[in-house]
Structure formats: C-alpha cells, structure tokens
C-alpha cells in the first residue's frame, strides 16, 4: 500500500523581498526519499526540476534553487512539488516573491528580507493540481 | 523517443486502446498529450495526462476516451468509436523546463473505424 | 471551453517575403502556448514555445510574439521549406482548466 505523502513546504532565503539584481534561493522541503523536487509558477508554464536532494534532518530532505540575480520578471507566486517513488506529493502553498527596487523608493514594500513579516503564503489549488516538464540543475533563473 | 501503438481497422462499437510507449526518458516528470487528426483536417486535441497523475480531456472526448498511464505507457482507449473517429492519432511529449511545448512527437497510428 | 481562433486560414507569399500568423483566444492563457508546423504524412514539429522562445533547431526566422489572448507567430525570409500548415495551441491547465485546444490551421503556400 502507498503511503500518504505530506505536502511539502517552500521558502525563500534571504526572503521574500529582494532587492533588484540580488540573489534569492527557494527552498523546497519533503520527507526523505525524494528523488525529485520540482519547482512551479502560478501564472508561467515554466518550471524547474532538481535531483540534487540533500538531507535536512533525520526526518526532512530538501532542494534549493538559486536565482542569482533577481529581475522584475521573477516576481510573482511559486510553489514546490516532490516526486518519492512511486508517485508525486501535493503541491506546497504559494510562496509570494517582491521584487524591489535597489534604492528603495516610496513604492518599494514596507518588508524587508528576513524580517519578522515572514513569506506571503497563498492556498495552492490542488483541484487542478498538474503542469509539466522538467530541466535539471539548481538554477531558476528561466522560472522568468 | 515516444511511440504510438494499437491502431487498427475496427467495426463501429468496438472498443480500442492506443498504447504511447516512452523512451529514453522518465515518464514520471513530463505530460503526455494525445492528438487526432482525421483525413484532410486539422489538429484536433483529445486530452492529457499529466507527470503528477491528473488526467483532462477536451469536452468533446469526455466519456468517450479514457486516459491512464504506467511507468513507461500512457493509453488512450476509445470505449465506443464510430465512423468519426477515423483518424491518425498521436501522442506527444512536453519540452524540459516548460509545459507549454510539445517538442517530442511519435509518428501516429492510423485508427479506421467502418463497418 | 478555450476556443483559439486563428487567421487567416491560408496565405500565399513569395519566397523571401514574410507571413504573420495570428491566433486569438478566448480567454487568457498566459504563457500557456505554442506554435506547431506540419508538412503532409508528418507528426507536428515544435516551432515557439512559452509563447517567445524558439524550439532547438528552428532558425531564427521564426518569431513568436504575444501574450494573454493575442499571439502571432511571424516567419521573415520565407523559404519553399517552409510551406506546410502552422497551428497554434494553448496547453494550459490552471485554476479554472482552459487546457488543450487547438487553432484551426494556415495553409502557407510559397510562389
């Protein structure tokens, strides 16, 4: 018998708001025995795949994918989904990423990266809870 | 590579199903779709089975196909064809890295259905 | 459901000259898209993706543009090779399902 997967969880380091042209890595966490973590867009169809799995605990394992240089374009909502053989999890909540200006203008959000505020989570909506294809390797950067 | 299999002349009501073999790759991270094309029409989408086991059909095909995969298959059969289900079928893979491209197409089976 | 609807249905260019495709659809589809060529007795070939990026091997002469509900896919410096029919897809599976559908087909016909 299958075992019931738990849905993985998702965050970003150093935050969820960063500044343009500064680096970001999300953060995807399951329970040992991932083979692969998939990295999604709520509005893209792009998506990005890691076999690069390590372990975070006696109990957790997780993926990291790293944008090196934020843009405007890689604002928006992102999730996590695992594949443990012989099948894939639940998809995690949405993640929300802000891009801010550099200099901080009068627009630019109230949070800071790593502040108290923590990451905007949304519902994932797991009625629909399918997408596509697969790259490997830990860069985001075409998640743009 | 992706392969379609299981095409055949048929009579009217008799149930068929198409096999779409994977090569080369892990089935388990991409969607499959399948993809008609009757003599001298165009492209006419029939459904999909996506990597994390959803499966969704155009609204036209909704009880009439069923779509279910293995390890290394994605079937398509056709519970009941008629005369209008004549047609090549194919099946296709999406490209690394992004859903919204079929890059990896079999070559198609020819399904005819008559009585 | 999704409905894409595509214009024109055939076009007639010389070679070296230029044809613009153009597919709409009915509701908005993000980057959920793709642009497909098929030469008769073949399977389709993967042109543009995502709805701007070239599939590997297409020359660059083919350009996806586009976003949402309007899409157009431009092919510059025509070639007899490039005669076949061309057809737009979306293959969005969201919130509310659009998934799947396909535009109606240009015949493109090199003089």
């Known amino acids: 018998q299958e075992e019931d997967l738990p849905r993985p969880s998702i965050s970003a380091e150093p935050g969820t708001v960063i500044p343009l042209g500064s680096h970001v890595t999300f953060v995807c966490r399951g329970p040992v025995g991932v083979q692969t973590f998939r990295l999604e867009r709520d509005s893209r169809s792009t998506y990005n795949d890691t076999e690069d799995v390590s372990q975070a605990s006696p109990s957790e394992s997780e993926a990291r994918f790293r944008i090196d240089s934020v843009r405007e374009g890689n604002a928006g909502l992102y999730r996590c989904i695992y594949y443990k053989p012989p099948k894939w999890s639940e998809q995690s909540d949405y993640l929300e990423l802000l891009v801010k200006e550099s200099s901080g203008g009068p627009d630019s959000p109230d949070t800071e990266p790593g502040s108290s505020a923590g990451p905007t989570q949304r519902p994932s909506d797991n009625s629909h809870n399918e997408h596509a294809p697969a790259s490997q390797g830990l860069k985001a950067e075409h998640l743009y | 590579a992706v392969k379609e299999s299981g095409g055949r002349l048929v009579t009217p009501g008799t149930p068929l199903t198409l096999t779409c073999t994977a090569s080369?790759?892990?089935?388990?991270?991409?969607?499959i779709q399948w993809v008609r094309q009757a003599p001298g029409k165009g492209l006419e989408y029939i459904g999909a089975?996506?990597?994390?086991?959803y499966t969704y059909y155009a609204s036209w095909a909704k009880g009439r196909v069923t779509i279910s995969r293995t390890s290394t298959t994605v079937d398509l059969k056709m519970t009941s064809p008629t005369t209008e289900d004549t047609a090549t079928y194919f099946c296709?893979?999406?490209?690394?890295?992004?859903?919204?491209?079929?890059?990896?197409w079999g070559p198609g089976t020819l399904v005819t259905v008559s009585s | 459901e999704l409905v894409l609807t595509q214009t024109p249905a055939s076009v007639s260019a010389a070679v070296g000259g230029t044809v613009t495709i153009k597919c709409q659809a009915s509701?908005?589809?993000?980057?959920?898209f793709a642009w497909y060529q098929q030469k008769p007795g073949q399977s389709p070939k993967l042109l543009i993706y995502?709805?701007?990026k070239l599939a590997s091997g297409v020359p660059p002469r083919f350009k996806g543009s586009g976003s949402g509900t309007e899409f157009t896919l431009t092919i510059s410096d025509l070639e007899c090779a490039d005669a076949a029919t061309y057809y737009c897809?979306?293959?969005?599976?969201?919130?509310?399902?659009?998934?799947?559908?396909f535009g109606g087909g240009t015949e493109v016909e090199i003089k």
């Open positions: 296709a893979r999406h490209i690394d890295g992004d859903y919204s491209g079929y890059a990896l």
């Open positions: 080369g790759f892990s089935l388990y991270k991409y969607n």
């Open positions: 089975s996506t990597y994390a086991g």
């Open positions: 509701q908005s589809i993000g980057t959920w």
């Open positions: 995502g709805p701007s």
């Open positions: 897809q979306s293959t969005y599976f969201g919130v509310d399902y659009l998934g799947g559908t």
